[in-house]
Each structure stands twice: as structure tokens, then as C-alpha cells.
Amino acid sequence: MHVAQPAVVLASSRGIASFVCEYASPGKATEVRVTVLRQADSQVTEVCAATYMMGNELTFLDDSICTGTSSGNQVNLTIQGLRAMDTGLYICKVELMYPPPYYLGIGNGTQIYVIDPEPCPDSD
Amino acid sequence: MHVAQPAVVLASSRGIASFVCEYASPGKATEVRVTVLRQADSQVTEVCAATYMMGNELTFLDDSICTGTSSGNQVNLTIQGLRAMDTGLYICKVELMYPPPYYLGIGNGTQIYVIDPEPCPDSD
């Protein structure tokens, strides 16, 4: 299953990055799982994951750094709290969980660049 | 003549970006000209240029946003005062001016990403 995502995204100076993950659904899925994985120095780590029913909101865990909304076959993902050290390739993984058959799609990744802001001068 | 430069550079939160432009000199040039060009939306504009004698400092114009140092066939370029709207592909062009023959080399460009900082809160 094909998954499309932008090649490059710049995080805002507040450490927030947003991108769209779009998948070409071969069937009529009712339950979809979206996982964001970060690849840096050939290490892959899971950033966040959410399962949602088509037409409903994405619900990430309360302590997740991700939020998202879905619209048809598009998922709008936002990652917050990013620092310069979090710069890396963020891969969107989409699973059509239900009904069978199960489909898996993995995007090519979005390179997110993060620049730490300069500290503001102390107010005297 | 081959010119190498990094594919991507992030400007600091102060709007400063630095990168190395390295050329494979076919001869013993004594006078070299380095030009930085910016390509965005298929428009190419000249950012800055400097001619230098091998072993001497690069001297850009006083009002230039560029500074630089040279070491052998490497030129260390710094561009300052960058804003988000200056994001683009910065191409390094190297000309071996003297002695003849004249050589020209153009790099593939360095994509410089610039993020404007959040304004600091007013001190009351």
C-alpha cells in the first residue's frame, strides 16, 4: 500500500512540525493505525501511534508528543516539543487493521529539521 | 572544474549559515573568484562575490552579507542576516581567474533552511 508524505518539513521556532501522511487505500478500512517512527543514524524509534475508526478523531496517548486529525485517506500529524537533537527522518507507517485483509504501508519519511531558539535576554 | 558543497545547511536562530565550498583545481591558480548565487522559484540572484589571491583573505564588499576564509582549495563561506523568506538553494560558483587558462566550476547548491525566531516577550 502506497503512503505519501512530504520530503522535508521545518519545525517552527517553538519546536512544532506538521505534515500530511496520505495513503492509497486498496479497500474500505474502518479501523486504521498510524505510527510515526524516527530514523536517525540507522536507529529506528517509535515516536507515537494511534488507532482510529474512519470518520473519528485520532487519539494518541495523553503523554504523546503527537496530535492529529484524519480526513478520508489523509492524516494530518503534528509533533511538538522538538529540539535540534530531534532532527531526523520521520516515517509514517499506516496499517489498515479492520476489516480483513490487513494492509501495511510505509512512507519514505519526512526529514524534519529543528533549530533550537536563542534564549531571550533576562529582563532586569 | 568540479565544485563540492553540502546538500543542506540549517541557518542558526540568529540567521547565520556557514558552509564549505571546495573545488578541484586543475592548475596552480593565484587569483580566484567566488560567487554565491541563490536559486528560488527558478530565479537566480547573486548574493555576494569576492576575488582573492591564493593564501590571502577573501574580501567581500563592506555591505555584503557574506564573509569567508580560504584554505587551499576550500572556501569557508558564512552568510548572515538571513530570514525565513531567504530559504533557498545557494550555489557556489568558482572561477580560476589567473594565470590562464580560465576555469569555471559551479556546485550543485546548498539548500539553506531559515526559520524566523519567535519574538521575545516585552520586559515590563
Epitope: V44, E46, A49, L61, I91, K93 | -
Partner: nanobody, 111 residues
Amino acid sequence: QVQLQESGGGLVQPGGSLRLSCAASGFTLSSYSMTWLRQAPGKGLEWVSTINSGGSTSYADSVKGRFAISRDNAKNTLYLQLNSLEIEDTGMYYCQGGLTRGQGTQVTVSS
């Protein structure tokens, strides 16, 4: 090298039980959402169960109440306990996490 290796499959009679294991090497299993999938002969893949990094679990309706997913963080191993097995549960069972999927273990339910 990141690898997932399933084991524990076999031939079992209807109503019987099996415990499938998935040993992870090259990454910390507890940091990932881990999923069990299965593929019946001549059919497409089917999602069975998922345990997320926080430990919460979910199951396909067809296995709810019969199968149980768990993991042992110390052993870096994922498990799937299969109870009250039915002939329709026959197939290749795979574990998956991150960008990796194992080679699978065969479960055959037959009288």
C-alpha cells in the same frame, strides 16, 4: 541487526492451546507498538492483536476472549497465548514492530 523471530507454532486439536513467542534482537521491544498478524492458506493477511508501548492491548473480534497478547521486557520477547483454538485459526502467525516483521510460525488446528 534488527530481527524478530517467532516460535511456538505447531499442530493442535480444536479446543487446544498454544503459546507463540517473538524474540526481538537489535531493538528494545517495549519501546514499540507490537502486532501479531496471521495469514490463512490462500487468504490475505489479517490483524490479530496489538500491544502499544504503554502496554494497552487490542484484539480482532474473531479472537477476542480467546487470545492474549503480552510481553516480557526483561526477555525482550512478545507472546501470544492462543486458547480455545478453532480450525479457522490455522495459518502462519507473524509478529511485527517498527519497520520489521518476522518470518512467521505455522499454526495448524486439525482433528
